[in-house]
C-alpha cells in the first residue's frame, strides 16, 4: 500500500495547525513540563514490517484524534482550529485505515506488534493522567501540544522512512 | 549534524548599534528555542534572553530587558541579537543555544562557536 | 529571580580524583538543574540535565544527583582533560540564572 502524497501533506498541515493553536505564552509554562516517556523506538522503522509501522501510525493518530476530540480539549482551544486540526487527522486516520486492511492481508501482523499498539497507549494514558493531574489547566495543555507536535513529527519521519522502503 | 553557526567578531564605537547572527542547521528550526547567553571577560555565564522562531515569541531577563532586542527569521533558519546604542560594559563573548522549550528533553544541548563583541573608542 | 550558588567557586585536584562540585538554589527547583562544562576560549557543553540525566556523548565519569536545593556534579576519577570551569543552571523558570562556577585546576 503507498500511501498518498496527500497524506504527508495532512501531515504536516496538522503540526502546522496544531503550532497555531497556543493560546498563551510557552515561556509561562517552563516549570510544567514532564516525562511522558515517549516511545521513541516505536518510530523506528528499521525494525518493523510495513504493516506493523503502518498499524503504529494508526494507533498514534487514533489517540492524538482521541485526546483532541474531549470537551476538556473543546474548551481548551480555539474552535475552528481544532476543527481543523480534528478534520486532517481524521482524512489520515482513513488512508491509514485503507492500508492497514490492505497489508494485513499481505503479512500476518506478529504479537511484537501488539505491545508496539500497547505502548502508544499507554503513552497517551500518561499524557492524559498528566492532564487530570494539572485539572487541565492553560499550562498542562501548552506542554501537551508541544508533546504531541513531537510525536506527530516522529510519526511524520516514520511515513517518510516506509515511503523509501517502497 | 546540528550546527549552530555564529556571525563574526565585531569592534564597535560606542553608540553604534549592532546585530550578530545565530543560523541553525541539521534539525527543524523551528521545533526549537534559541536563547543568548553572555560571558563578560573572565566572568561567568548570563542568560539573557530566549526566541521562540515559530512565531517570535521572546522572553528577556530583567537585566537586559530593554537593552537588546532578540529576533529570528524562520525562513533563513537565523536568530539575532541586536544594540541600538553600544556602550563600553556591552564588550563580551556571545553565544546562541537551542533549547527544547516544553519538551522533556536536554536544555542548551548545542551552542554556537560565541561572537566576540568589543565596544571601545 | 532564583538564585544559584556554587562551591567552592576553584579547586585544585590530580589525575584520578574524585571531584565534587555542589550547587544551592533559593528555592526548590525539583530536579530541573542542569551542568555544564566550559574550556578556555570555548563554548559551554552540556554535561547533565534534569539533575542526573548523562548527555549523550558525555564520559560515565560524569554524574549528577540531588533534587530541590542541593545538588551534586561529580566526577569519578578526573581526566586531564576535565580540567575546566563547571556551571550549573536552574531549569525551572525565567529568567534561567546560572551558579558562578567553580574553576577545576592541576595541583
Known amino acids: 500500500c503507498d500511501l498518498p502524497q496527500t497524506h504527508s501533506l495532512g501531515n504536516r498541515r496538522a503540526l502546522i495547525l496544531l503550532g497555531q493553536m497556543g493560546r498563551i505564552s510557552p515561556f509561562s509554562c517552563l516549570k510544567d513540563r514532564h516525562d511522558f516517556r515517549i516511545p521513541q523506538e516505536e518510530f523506528d522503522g528499521n525494525q518493523f514490517q510495513k504493516a506493523q509501522a503502518i498499524s503504529v501510525l494508526h494507533e498514534m493518530i487514533q489517540q492524538t484524534f482521541n485526546l483532541f476530540s474531549t470537551e476538556d480539549s473543546s474548551a481548551a482551544w480555539e474552535q475552528s482550529l481544532l476543527e481543523k486540526f480534528s478534520t486532517e487527522l481524521y482524512q489520515q486516520l482513513n488512508d491509514l485505515e485503507a492500508c492497514v486492511i490492505q497489508e494485513v492481508g499481505v503479512e500476518e501482523t506478529p504479537l511484537m506488534n501488539e505491545d508496539s499498539i500497547l505502548a502508544v497507549r499507554k503513552y497517551f494514558q500518561r499524557i492524559t493522567l498528566y492532564l487530570i493531574e494539572r485539572k487541565y489547566s492553560p499550562c498542562a495543555w501548552e506542554v501537551v501540544r508541544a508533546e504531541i507536535m513531537r510525536s506527530l513529527s516522529f510519526s511524520t519521519n516514520l511515513q517518510k522512512r516506509l515511503r523509501r522502503k517502497d | 549534524e546540528v550546527q549552530l553557526v555564529q556571525s563574526g567578531a565585531e569592534v564597535k564605537k560606542p553608540g553604534e548599534s549592532l546585530k550578530i547572527s545565530c543560523k541553525g542547521s541539521g534539525y527543524s528550526f523551528t521545533s526549537y528555542w534559541i536563547g543568548w547567553v553572555r560571558q563578560m571577560p573572565g566572568k561567568g555565564l548570563e542568560w539573557m534572553g530566549i526566541i521562540d522562531p515559530s512565531d517570535s515569541d521572546t522572553a528577556y531577563s530583567p537585566s537586559f530587558q530593554g537593552q537588546v532586542t532578540i529576533s529570528a527569521d524562520k525562513s533563513i533558519s537565523t536568530a539575532y541579537l541586536q544594540w541600538s546604542s553600544l556602550k563600553a560594559s556591552d564588550t563580551a563573548m556571545y553565544y546562541c543555544?537551542?533549547?527544547?522549550?516544553?519538551?522533556?528533553?536536554?536544555?542548551?544541548?548545542?551552542w554556537g562557536q560565541g561572537t566576540l563583541v568589543t565596544v571601545s573608542s | 529571580d532564583i538564585q544559584m550558588t556554587q562551591s567552592p567557586s576553584s579547586l585544585s585536584a590530580s589525575v584520578g580524583d574524585r571531584v565534587t562540585i555542589t550547587c544551592r538554589a533559593s528555592?526548590?527547583?525539583?530536579?530541573?538543574l542542569n551542568w555544564y562544562q566550559q574550556k578556555p576560549g570555548k563554548a559551554p557543553k552540556l554535561l547533565i540535565y534534569f539533575a542526573s540525566s548523562l548527555q549523550s556523548g558525555v564520559p560515565s565519569r560524569f554524574s549528577g544527583s540531588g533534587s530541590g536545593t542541593d545538588f551534586t556534579l561529580t566526577i569519578s576519577s578526573l581526566q586531564p582533560e576535565d580540567f575546566a570551569t563547571y556551571y550549573c543552571?536552574?531549569?525551572?523558570?525565567?529568567?534561567?540564572?546560572f551558579g558562578q562556577g567553580t574553576k577545576v585546576e592541576i595541583k
Open positions: 528555592q526548590s527547583i525539583g530536579d530541573f
Open positions: 543552571q536552574q531549569a525551572l523558570d525565567f529568567p534561567l540564572t
Open positions: 543555544a537551542r533549547h527544547p522549550g516544553l519538551n522533556w528533553a536536554p536544555d542548551f544541548d548545542y
